[in-house]
C-alpha cells in the first residue's frame, strides 16, 4: 500500500437545506482507471463511513440509491454533495481515495472538512 | 499557483457605498470559502464574514451585519464585498482571504472614507 | 463571542528560539479551530505562514513551525533571523466564523 496526498477544503457551510459540498483532490501518482471515495464522518473521536462510490476515470460516481452522496469526478478531483444534514451532523468529513486498479494499490486520506449545519428555523404557523 | 487578486484603491464619501474584488486563480475557485477581512489603520485583523462559492451561503460577523454583502460570480472565480452606509470609521485595508490547511491572502484595498 | 488572546510582544536574539502562543476563552485550542497563522510586515499584506495547527505554507521556511501546547496554538522559530520581525497574527475557527488575535509584535534584538 503507497501513500498518496489528498486535499480538501477545511471548513464548508451546509445551506438551509442541509446540504453540504465540499471538492476532494487527490495527487495520482500514476494512471489510475479505477479509484474508490469514501467520505467518513468523525464526531467525538469516533468515525463512522458516510457513503462509498467506487467509478472508472472518466465516468460519474455512482453511490447506492440509499445514500444521501452524490457526486462528480474530473481529473483528479472529486466533488462531493451530502445531503439531508442537521445540526446534529454537524462534524469531521474526511475523504478518503484509493486507487485499485491498476496497481499498485495508492491509498489516501485527507485531513477532513469541518461541516457546520443549522437546522432551519421552523415555518410558523398559517392560518391557510 | 493560487493567486487572489484584489480591485485597487477607493476614495469615498459618507454614507456611500463600495464595492471591491478579489480575482481567484490557481485553485478550484467552488472548492473552498472566501473570507473578507478588515484592517483600519495601525489595528488588528477584523475579520467580515465569509461566502461559500458553491452554494452562496454567507456569514458575516455582527458587527457588519446588515451593512456588508457578499457575492460571487464563479464563472470569472471572482468574489465581491460591498459595504454600505460607509462612516469614516470604516478607513481601512480590506483583504480577501483563503483560510484554510493552505492559506492565501489578497494584496489588500484601501478604502478612504472621507467627507 | 470568543475571544483570541496573543502575547503583546515578544523579544528574540538572532539565532535564538521563541514561542508565540494563541489562546482561546472558550477553553483549549484545538485541531477543529484550525489554528491559522499569519505574519505581516509593515506596509504589506498579511502571509500566510501555517494553517490548520501545523501545515506550512510553500513558503514558509523551515525554522517556523506550528503546534498545539497546553491547550493554547503555539508558533515556533527556531534559529530566528532578522527578517522575522514582523507582527503574527493567530485565527481560530469557531463552527461557522474565524476570529483573529490581536498580533504578537516580534523583535529580533
Known amino acids: 500500500c503507497k501513500a498518496m496526498h489528498v486535499a480538501q477544503p477545511a471548513v464548508v457551510l451546509a445551506s438551509s437545506r442541509g446540504i453540504a459540498s465540499f471538492v476532494c483532490e487527490y495527487a495520482s501518482p500514476g494512471k489510475a482507471t479505477e479509484v474508490r471515495v469514501t467520505v467518513l464522518r468523525q464526531a467525538d473521536s469516533q468515525v463512522t463511513e458516510v457513503c462509498a462510490a467506487t467509478y472508472m476515470m472518466g465516468n460519474e460516481l455512482t453511490f447506492l440509491d440509499d445514500s444521501i452522496c452524490t457526486g462528480t469526478s474530473s481529473g483528479n478531483q472529486v466533488n462531493l454533495t451530502i445531503q439531508g444534514l442537521r445540526a446534529m451532523d454537524t462534524g469531521l468529513y474526511i475523504c478518503k481515495v484509493e486507487l485499485m486498479y491498476p496497481p499498485p494499490y495508492y491509498l489516501g486520506i485527507g485531513n477532513g472538512t469541518q461541516i457546520y449545519v443549522i437546522d432551519p428555523e421552523p415555518c410558523p404557523d398559517s392560518d391557510f | 499557483q493560487v493567486q487572489l487578486v484584489e480591485s485597487g484603491a477607493e476614495v469615498k464619501k459618507p454614507g456611500a457605498s463600495v464595492k471591491v474584488s478579489c480575482k481567484a486563480s490557481g485553485y478550484s475557485f467552488t472548492g473552498y470559502t472566501m473570507n473578507w477581512v478588515r484592517q483600519a489603520p495601525g489595528q488588528c485583523l477584523e475579520w467580515i464574514g465569509l461566502i461559500n462559492p458553491y452554494n452562496n451561503i454567507t456569514n458575516y460577523a455582527q458587527k457588519f451585519q446588515g451593512r456588508v454583502t457578499f457575492t460571487v460570480d464563479t464563472s470569472i472565480s471572482t468574489a465581491y464585498m460591498e459595504l454600505s452606509r460607509l462612516r469614516s470609521d470604516d478607513t481601512g485595508v480590506y483583504f480577501c482571504?483563503?483560510?484554510?490547511?493552505?492559506?492565501?491572502w489578497g494584496q489588500g484595498t484601501l478604502v478612504t472614507v472621507s467627507a | 463571542q470568543a475571544v483570541v488572546t496573543q502575547e503583546p510582544s515578544l523579544t528574540v536574539s538572532p539565532g535564538g528560539t521563541v514561542t508565540l502562543t494563541c489562546g482561546s476563552s472558550t477553553g483549549a485550542v484545538t485541531t477543529s479551530n484550525f489554528p491559522n497563522w499569519v505574519q505581516q510586515k509593515p506596509g504589506q499584506a498579511p502571509r500566510s505562514l501555517i494553517g490548520?495547527?501545523?501545515n506550512k505554507a510553500s513558503w514558509t521556511p523551515a525554522r517556523f513551525s506550528g503546534s498545539l501546547l497546553g491547550g493554547k496554538a503555539a508558533l515556533t522559530i527556531s534559529g530566528a533571523q532578522p527578517e522575522d520581525e514582523a507582527e503574527y497574527y493567530c485565527a481560530l475557527w469557531y463552527s461557522n466564523h474565524w476570529v483573529f488575535g490581536c498580533g504578537t509584535k516580534l523583535t529580533v534584538l
Open positions: 490548520g495547527t501545523n
Open positions: 482571504a483563503r483560510l484554510d490547511y493552505r492559506s492565501y
